[in-house]
């Protein structure tokens, strides 16, 4: 799984250990070993949500399986909670796109997972 | 809806009010309230198009519905026009990927839109 | 086609001509003219893979067609090889998401490819 956060929150406001915490919590939530989890945080972005530049985040979670209605709601609760607790972003200023990737469409280690 | 522009145009060349204009124009084009529109502009990128580093842009528009053949052509006309007028990027050096997102695959406010 | 590389490798470690090489190699691999190929490299990113910040990359390749099981394996071999040779990123710390785009969902030059 790959989780990406783009946010207008400054780099200095991203706490030490935030990527580690995301990794651990995504491992718990997806049931995938932490060794397969990638996390990418992009602060200081030029972005608006609802036309204002208050703190906001545009995110994506790509996974081979483990994507679906109930699971995505659970991920949203988790991830919006972390973004609120750690980056002080209001959950109603967060979008998270979920992608259920086909194993044949994910490259790794010189091949794919298919 | 979420509109993202990645471009090699420098930050200084992004005019004041560009994100606001994108928000308003996308609200009008998609028929969605501006309060639900997120815009993200990423300047100063290391990118080439056709093998050259003349001004170019790689963009995406994610929306729950309002994506389709005729609509996408209209969005492309609008967005290429704005990128040309405001950032001086030639329309033939712009790609825009359109994504019709399932409501269950878009997280917001601690849950999803499903 | 559009190839994007996000990496925690620093800008200074991206060799001169890397984007040109990616363009040429992707043109050859996809059978698409170089004039249609866009490449975007984003260094210096705050990212982890397997919970560590050793060199890693999160990538995507979008194409109208030319995406599939065997082709993706070939692209992965090519691209992981280039990332290893040029940026010194271990192939088992690279993810590449492949997207087979519908022509109607790719905007260019004020319209779409449909």
């Amino acid at each position: 799984p790959m989780f990406i956060v783009n946010t207008n929150v400054p780099r200095a406001s991203v706490p030490e250990g935030f990527l580690s915490e995301l990794t651990q919590q995504l491992a718990q939530a997806t049931g995938k070993p932490a060794q397969y989890i990638a996390v990418h945080v992009v602060p200081d972005q030029l972005m608006t949500f609802s036309g204002t530049n208050d703190p906001c985040a545009l995110c994506s979670l790509h996974s081979i399986g483990k994507i679906g209605g109930a699971q995505n709601r659970n991920y949203s609760k988790l991830l919006c909670g972390l973004l609120s607790d750690r980056l002080h972003i209001s959950p109603d200023r967060v979008y998270i796109n979920y992608y259920d990737m086909n194993a044949a469409n994910v490259g790794w280690n010189g091949s794919t997972f298919a | 809806p979420m509109f993202i522009v990645n471009t090699n145009v420098p930050r200084a060349s992004v005019p004041e009010g560009f994100l606001s204009e994108l928000t308003q124009q996308l609200a009008q084009a998609t028929g969605k309230p501006a309060q639900y529109i997120a815009v993200h502009v990423v300047p100063d990128q290391l990118m080439t198009f056709s093998g050259t580093n003349d001004p170019c842009a790689l963009c995406s528009l994610h929306s729950i519905g309002k994506i389709g053949g005729a609509q996408n052509r209209n969005y492309s006309k609008l967005l290429c026009g704005l990128l040309s007028d405001r950032l001086h990027i030639s329309p033939d050096r712009v790609y825009i990927n359109y994504y019709d997102m399932n409501a269950a695959n878009v997280g917001w406010n601690g849950s999803t839109f499903a | 086609p559009m190839f994007i590389v996000n990496t925690n490798v620093p800008r200074a470690s991206v060799p001169e001509g890397f984007l040109s090489e990616l363009t040429q190699q992707l043109a050859q691999a996809t059978g698409k003219p170089a004039q249609y190929i866009a490449v975007h490299v984003v260094p210096d990113q705050l990212m982890t893979f397997s919970g560590t910040n050793d060199p890693c990359a999160l990538c995507s390749l979008h194409s109208i067609g030319k995406i599939g099981g065997a082709q993706n394996r070939n692209y992965s071999k090519l691209l992981c090889g280039l990332l290893s040779d040029r940026l010194h990123i271990s192939p088992d710390r690279v993810y590449i998401n492949y997207y087979d785009m519908n022509a109607a969902n790719v905007g260019w030059n004020g319209s779409t490819f449909a």
């Epitope: 919590q25 718990q28 049931g31 070993p33 397969y36 081979i64 399986g65 659970n74 988790l78 | - | -």
Partner: antibody, heavy 118, light 111 residues
Framework: QIQLVQSGPELKKPGETVKISCKAS????????MNWVSQPPGKGLEWMGW????????TYADDFKGRFAFSLDTSASTAYLTINNLKNEDTATYFC???????????WGQGTTLTVSA | NIVLTQSPASLALSLGQRATISCRTS??????????MHWYQQKPGQSPKLLIY???NLESGVPARFSGSGSRTDFTLTIDPVEADDAATYYC?????????FGGGTQLEIK
Amino acid sequence: QIQLVQSGPELKKPGETVKISCKASGYSFRNYGMNWVSQPPGKGLEWMGWINTYTGEPTYADDFKGRFAFSLDTSASTAYLTINNLKNEDTATYFCARSNYGNYFDYWGQGTTLTVSA
Amino acid sequence: NIVLTQSPASLALSLGQRATISCRTSESVDSYASSFMHWYQQKPGQSPKLLIYLASNLESGVPARFSGSGSRTDFTLTIDPVEADDAATYYCQQSNEDPRTFGGGTQLEIK
């Protein structure tokens, strides 16, 4: 060292409610999911579901939706299983088990034996 | 739901012999570069104990006599050589999809 310690055996009548506890120690409680597994006498293991220890969000297997509830007291590093409106067929040993990343169960409680009888 | 079928249901072996327990799944439990299949040992009156995780990884503290193999839908737990202390019931479990399901168990008796 890592331990999961469950509450003691329970004898209940049909229609009553039981609450079984599972106290964790030796690790960061909120970083690992907690599962509940049932084992009727002389039978095999059945996964009941799990609770996300960060969000408190429970997930139930189909056979355990309705009368069964998972909850947490994160300040006490404790997970709970509550069974309402007990039935004779709820007689079983209930285990809590920590899921490591990959959802294998690396640490188990000692089990709580529940007997439901009129 | 993914169904796990263990065989045999029981086996009796002499000390020093090799025990082979099979677990077949109704669909693949492979994802990413791993097989999400795990093996447990349970002795009477005790809680289960993790032996093997992700098909072939030996849990810390488990003797090297235990090994796991397989991928996709066919998995094997091997104990070689068996010892008296190995008398127990062995369960496979998949975690590729919820619900996380167990096999029916294999009872190993040491003659």
